[in-house]
Interface confidence: low
């Protein structure tokens, strides 16, 4: 390999290097490649040089396109007709000189916050692009359409947020915002101007016309209308609070809808239980006043007893299933019918047949094993399933089992 590289001179974006050739293994070196490494790079990376192509008789080159105020080390790799050789030992580590910052913060945005606040956020400039010590940000903002910019200096490279608080800031009003950069060398550019809205006011009116109905023992559907009166504060969605009659309201669970949806389903509830529900509008500032509370009782739970005494027999491409009627207990929903679930043994998707009888006839090909289960259904939902029944592949036309 070539002998270790020497850094002869370094500027903010360039480094002049020299090296002595190593042994060529009896095949002349045709070119050299320069590689660089920084604390921020993943391993060694090829860099641009002047001359762009370094022939085998050249032992000096200038690396260009470096980042200011970054620690670099360099090495060379020699190549000949046989291939690429071992890299040289790395040079000493040297830091490029400082320069004015050139990269502006990305994703300047903001919004939200508390009353009378303008929240401005941005992505910090990575350390390797700060170009010098003493890096910081200049936050500039003005009410949309006004002439004069207000400026705030944040002398911290880690700053990613600025909050302007003033009673004169109206809720959800637009501001033009830009964020500039500076370091010890001076001020750099500003980001493009973007529009950010001040903190909004939480909704001031409650939703109207709350109505809830029980769908099953476990599910409730809630409906409401957007506030009837003129509401201040943008509505981003609604929050539905629900709690059991025997629980405290502060233990209520909450679910949120997004957008102008004015109904939602609440699931995983207990059967035969009185629930209280209330709805609020919300936005980024918080929630508005609560609607009146409505009450709804979930339906009785579905039958807990599974269908029993299941008998099957087959004839003429049919499987006939019979089972005992399921009787609902006093605290259970009345049986409305039965669901017969079946699938091929090799197939994961399940087919369902509903019947209000205690028997069913399935027309199925006989060259497969079947898995069958039966469960009652009711207003309270589906009841307990029977044990799975495996009906084996039937080679003859008649078979029976239980």
């Amino acid at each position: 390999p070539p002998e270790a590289v020497t850094i002869d001179e370094i500027t903010d974006t360039t480094a002049q290097l020299s090296w002595r050739p190593g042994p060529d293994n009896h095949s002349p070196i045709t070119m050299y490649v320069i590689q660089a490494r920084t604390p921020f790079s993943v391993g060694w990376q090829a860099v641009s040089t002047v001359p762009e192509l370094i022939d085998g008789k050249t032992f000096t080159a200038t690396v260009v396109g470096l980042n200011p105020w970054v620690e670099y080390e360099f090495r060379t790799v020699a190549a000949n007709v046989i291939g690429i050789g071992e890299p040289s030992r790395p040079s000493e580590k040297r830091r490029t000189e400082e320069a004015l910052p050139e990269v502006t913060p990305a994703n300047v945005s903001g919004g939200g916050g508390s009353k009378s606040e303008l929240v401005i956020t941005w992505e910090t400039v990575p350390e390797e692009l700060q170009n010098g010590r003493g890096f910081g940000y200049v936050v500039a903002f003005r009410p949309y359409g006004k002439m004069i910019w207000m400026l705030t200096v944040l002398a911290s490279a880690d700053a990613s947020r600025y909050v302007f608080r003033n009673e004169s800031v109206h809720p959800f009003s637009p501001f033009e915002v830009k964020v500039g950069v500076f370091n010890n060398k001076g001020e750099g550019p500003f980001s493009p101007t973007t529009v950010v809205y001040s903190a909004e006011e939480e909704p001031t009116k409650p939703p109207a016309s709350i109505f809830a109905r029980s769908l099953s023992a476990t599910d409730i559907e809630v409906f409401w209308a957007s506030p009837l009166e003129k509401n201040r504060g943008r509505i981003q969605g609604y929050e539905v609070k629900y709690w059991r009659h025997e629980d405290k309201e502060e233990n209520a669970r909450k679910i949120r809808t997004v957008g102008n949806q004015t109904s939602t389903k609440i699931t995983n509830l207990k059967g035969s239980v009185l629930y209280h529900l209330a709805v609020k509008a919300y936005n980024s500032a918080g929630t508005g006043p609560s609607s009146a509370t409505v009450n709804v009782t979930t339906r009785k739970p579905p039958p807990s007893q599974p269908p029993g005494n299941i008998i099957w027999n087959s004839s003429d491409s049919k499987i006939i299933l019979n089972w005992d009627q399921v009787k609902a207990l006093d605290n259970e929903s009345e049986v409305k019918g039965y669901k017969v679930l079946y699938r091929w043994n090799r197939q994961s998707s399940t087919s369902v047949i509903e019947t209000n009888k205690t028997s069913v006839e399935l027309s199925l090909p006989f060259d497969e094993d079947y898995i069958i289960e039966i469960k009652p259904f009711s207003d309270g939902g589906d009841g307990s399933s029977s044990e799975q029944i495996r009906i084996p592949k039937i080679s003859n036309a008649y078979a029976r089992g239980s």
Partner: antibody, heavy 123, light 107 residues
């Protein structure tokens, strides 16, 4: 039983990057918010970062915002904290924690904690 | 920031109340959690979450309440093994935070 096991923190150099992984078991991982909380020697608890069950929302304390990234792999039931540009004040014990409910979030809702892993940032 | 007293003390069997204030109305509620730490560097234990919910393995002498912007942890019939630092957790208007901790000494 819920268990939260943090990877070893160890000695880190200032300006470097720290990656901590918490392996969770005993609950439906993808349903719960997960947290990183730290404690400097002789100091109190400090909220660091939080991630929603699906991973779509993240929250950070101002002290680490811009330096920290919290992420999760629901397939592996792991949550990761990446903390860059380490400082001496990042020294402390880092705890992984989970939210108590699938519907609540924030520093008021933690119900389970890992044993913690010690991180020392020093040159 | 959340504010809590730096220390409280009580005799065994007495009732202790630790308060936490400074929480901000956040997404429809003031929420506080309470976390017990028996020695620095040992894992905290949740005694109350979301104002008044107690994990199943926590004794019933621990209870919590939230009234406006103040949360309260109550230990009814304090015992020697309850001696620890108690931290409240909540939202202070800009970020989720923990209080500085209250040292409970059982005399």
């Amino acid at each position: 039983a819920v268990t939260l096991d943090e990877s070893e923190g160890g000695l880190q150099t200032p300006g470097g990057a720290l990656s901590l992984v918490c392996k969770a078991s005993g609950f439906t991982f993808s349903s719960f918010n997960m947290f990183w909380v730290r404690q400097a020697p002789g100091k109190g608890l400090e909220y660091v970062a939080e991630i929603s069950g699906g991973g779509g929302s993240t929250w950070y304390a101002p002290a680490v915002k811009g330096r920290a990234t919290i992420s999760r792999d629901n397939g592996q039931s792991t949550v990761r904290l990446q903390l860059n540009n380490l400082r001496a004040e990042d020294t402390g014990t880092y705890y992984c924690a989970k939210s108590a409910d699938t519907w609540s979030y924030g520093a008021a809702t933690i119900d389970a904690w890992g044993h913690g892993t010690e991180v020392i940032v020093s040159s | 920031a959340l504010t809590q007293p730096s220390s409280v003390s009580a005799n065994p069997g007495e009732t202790v109340k630790i308060t936490c204030s400074g929480g901000t109305y956040s997404y429809g509620n003031y929420y506080y959690g309470w976390y017990q730490q028996k020695s620095p560097g040992s894992a905290p234990v949740t005694v109350i979450y979301n104002n008044n919910n107690r994990p199943s393995d926590i004794p019933s002498r621990f209870s919590g309440s939230g009234s406006g912007s103040t949360g309260t942890l109550t230990i009814t019939g304090v015992r020697a093994e309850d001696e620890a630092v108690y931290y409240c957790g909540g939202y202070d208007g800009s970020t989720d935070v923990f209080g500085a901790g209250t040292t409970l000494t059982v005399l």
